[in-house]
């Protein structure tokens, strides 16, 4: 690696994948193993993330980019950059502090993650229940009895499941 020549900050010429080594007259040295620098002009390289335990490697660390992890089967990612893995549950369940628990009557979860949500209240829209809800599925609302004239068919599909927001950690 050639010694940098910038008149202002000699380190600014060090590319990604290197660091500016003050102990060696500010030459650009390659990042040591298990480290990376994703931008130029770095004074040290960053430690590569390790995907261990419940995490598995989605992308290996390189000299210019960090490793990326996802979760082993039976778990799903939470947080920015998959900072946590959370246990999957079955449809019709939600994860509590005591593990996976069935949705209470009147609630459902159609995914392996997230929380149980209340069935749609058809009567709020002036409709009736066409198909009863289960732990895994929302109710299906149909037309109100007054709308049941011959030829009328207006089945309203349930609203799409909404994922709870996850703040980065």
């Amino acid at each position: 690696f050639e010694r940098t020549r910038s008149l202002q900050d000699p380190c600014s010429n060090c590319p990604a994948g290197t660091f500016c080594d003050n102990n060696r007259n500010q030459i650009c040295s390659p990042c040591p193993p298990n480290s990376f620098s994703s931008a130029g002009g770095q004074r040290t390289c960053d430690i590569c993330r390790q995907c261990k335990g419940v995490f598995r490697t989605r992308k290996e660390c390189s000299s210019t980019s960090n490793a990326e992890c996802d979760c082993t089967p039976g778990f799903h990612c939470l947080g920015a950059g998959c900072s946590m893995c959370e246990q999957d549950c079955k449809q019709g369940q939600e994860l509590t502090k005591k593990g996976c628990k069935d949705c209470c009557f009147g609630t459902f979860n159609d995914q392996k993650r997230g929380i149980c949500r209340p069935w749609t209240n058809c009567s709020l829209d002036g409709k009736s229940v066409l198909v009863n809800g289960t732990k895994e599925r929302d109710v299906v609302c149909g037309p109100s009895p007054a709308d049941l004239s011959p030829g009328a068919s207006s089945v309203t599909p349930p609203a799409p499941a909404r994922e709870p927001g996850h703040s980065p950690q």
């Epitope: 990042c31 193993p33 298990n34 480290s35 994703s38 770095q42 004074r43 390790q50 261990k52 980065p168």
Partner: antibody, heavy 115, light 107 residues
Framework: EVQLQESGPSLVKPSQTLSLTCSVT????????WNWNRKFPGNKFEYMGY???????YYNPSLKSRISITRDTSKNQYYLQLNSVTTEDTATYYC?????????WGQGTLVTVSA | DIKMTQSPSSMYASLGERVTITCKAS??????LYWFQQKPGKSPETLIY???RLVDGVPSRFSGSGSGQDYSLTISSLEYEDMGIYYC?????????FGGGTKLEIK
């Protein structure tokens, strides 16, 4: 040369919020991972958490309900807030950039929690 | 959390003596280990990274070794300026955790 400098009150009352600033020169906080650690009387160190180049944060689970690390890239500073402090939070607080082959440390600032 | 058990917690040694400090992790840390030296009133300085790689500018009398759960820092011939507190730190897994420190004093 990379320099980190902690600043903030040296005395905080119990139940109040401890607020510290780390001012960085010679490097940009828009790259890398910027950390807070503390050293208790008796020389035990604790890792507190980081804020990253992308503004994501990690907090030690032992502090998670009380800690916040934020930054201001225009000032090249990052901040520590620790809520509901007790006398157990009396320590020397250090900001650091862990790295390979170099780890950069601030000089540390002693914060005493006392009524 | 990974627990780092460092020993001894304090020791006296003579100038020129060979000194070894150890750190044991509660699980395999894949050599993701720093050794730091802290002198009174100063911030810590990195001596070793990745368990056995000497930081540029650190005297060659310092060396690190180990793998898996067991690591050590050796000073081959103690000098007066080596007194201080030595810490290991694992950076294999968050939250990073420190050893309890070894206070090294001159006999």
């Amino acid at each position: 040369e990379v320099q980190l400098q902690e600043s903030g009150p040296s005395l905080v009352k119990p139940s109040q919020t401890l607020s510290l600033t780390c001012s960085v020169t010679g490097d940009s906080i828009t790259s890398g991972y910027w950390n807070w650690n503390r050293k208790f009387p008796g020389n035990k160190f604790e890792y507190m958490g980081y804020i990253s180049y992308s503004d994501s944060a990690y907090y030690n689970p032992s502090l998670k309900s009380r800690i916040s690390i934020t930054r201001d890239t225009s000032k090249n500073q990052y901040y520590l807030q620790l809520n509901s402090v007790t006398t157990e939070d009396t320590a020397t607080y250090y900001c650091t950039r862990w790295g390979i082959p170099f780890a950069f440390w601030g000089q540390g600032t002693l914060v005493t929690v006392s009524a | 959390d990974i627990k780092m058990t460092q020993s001894p917690s304090s020791m006296y040694a003579s100038l020129g003596e060979r000194v070894t400090i150890t750190c044991k992790a509660s699980q395999d840390i894949d050599s993701y280990l720093y050794w730091f030296q802290q002198k009174p009133g100063k911030s810590p300085e990195t001596l070793i990274y990745h368990a056995n790689r000497l930081v540029d500018g650190v005297p060659s009398r310092f060396s690190g070794s180990g793998s898996g759960q067991d690591y050590s820092l050796t000073i081959s011939s103690l000098e007066y300026e080596d007194m201080g507190i030595y810490y290991c730190l694992q950076y294999d897994e968050f939250p990073y955790t420190f050893g309890g420190g070894t206070k090294l004093e001159i006999k």
